[in-house]
């Protein structure tokens, strides 16, 4: 029974539940936008054709004191495989390029959706 | 906020080449699925390409097939639309525009005026 037990604790999440919990939240974020996201933090805008996760983590988490985000910002850590931190530049952001948080929220969420049809979950 | 600025129209003799550019600001513009849409003088719009946001994928309206190339730089955040053997019937104003079926993520340049006459 012991070695049982093992099949009932949960185990890793699968990717698409990842990602769909990842699309959800972000949903959450944009329905429930009152005031500026954020208050209008800017932040930089990444391309989205590869190392989509780990970039988009180092953008947000230049964000601080920003509880509306702090749940996605944990949840991009979970598909980066390193530990992403503040002041962090990544070569996939745009150069030179700042977008407004609640447009990069948004944009990503459109992203993600197109990678869950695709069945792209990683 | 976000921003689309088109570029490199002009006059052109029937035959030649020009080639248009859309500069895109404000949003994430890599994600974006982009087109091309032109509207010749007192005509309706009318779709002249899209590419989707990898770059991948292109499609063209039968009237330019063969002729016009879309192409995007999402390093440089940039559109581009190759036009080669202009015919008069290509004069009209072209908008570059988001090609997404999501409410919400319509964005729309403001257009380039491109003449073809001798």
């Known amino acids: 029974l012991t070695c049982l037990g093992g099949f009932a604790s949960p185990g890793p999440v699968p990717p698409s539940t990842a990602l769909r919990e990842l699309i959800e939240e972000l949903v959450n974020i944009t329905q429930n936008q009152k005031a500026p996201l954020c208050n209008g933090s800017m932040v930089w805008s990444i391309n989205l054709t590869a190392g989509m996760y780990c970039a988009a983590l180092e953008s947000l988490i230049n964000v601080s004191g920003c509880s509306a985000i702090e749940k996605t910002q944990r949840m991009l850590s979970g598909f980066c495989p390193h530990k992403v931190s503040a002041g962090q530049f990544s070569s996939l952001h745009v150069r030179d390029t700042k977008i407004e948080v609640a447009q990069f929220v948004k944009d990503l969420l459109l992203h993600l959706k197109k990678l869950f049809r695709e069945g792209q979950f990683n | 906020g976000v921003q689309l600025l088109e570029s490199g129209g002009g006059l052109v003799q029937p035959g030649g080449s020009l080639r248009l550019s859309c500069a895109a600001s404000?949003?994430?513009?890599?994600?974006?699925?982009m087109g091309w849409v032109r509207q010749a003088p007192g005509k309706g719009l009318e779709w002249v390409s899209s590419?989707?946001?990898?770059?991948?994928?292109?499609y063209y309206a039968d009237s330019v097939k063969g002729r016009f190339t879309i192409s995007r730089d999402n390093s440089k955040n940039t559109l581009y639309l190759q036009m080669n053997s202009l015919r008069a019937e290509d004069t009209a104003v072209y908008y570059c525009?988001?090609?997404?079926?999501?409410?919400?993520?319509?964005?729309w340049g403001q257009g380039t005026l491109v003449t073809v006459s001798s």
């Open positions: 525009a988001t090609a997404e079926d999501e409410p919400g993520y319509d964005y």
């Open positions: 404000g949003f994430m513009f890599s994600g974006y699925d």
């Open positions: 590419i989707d946001w990898k770059g991948g994928k292109t």
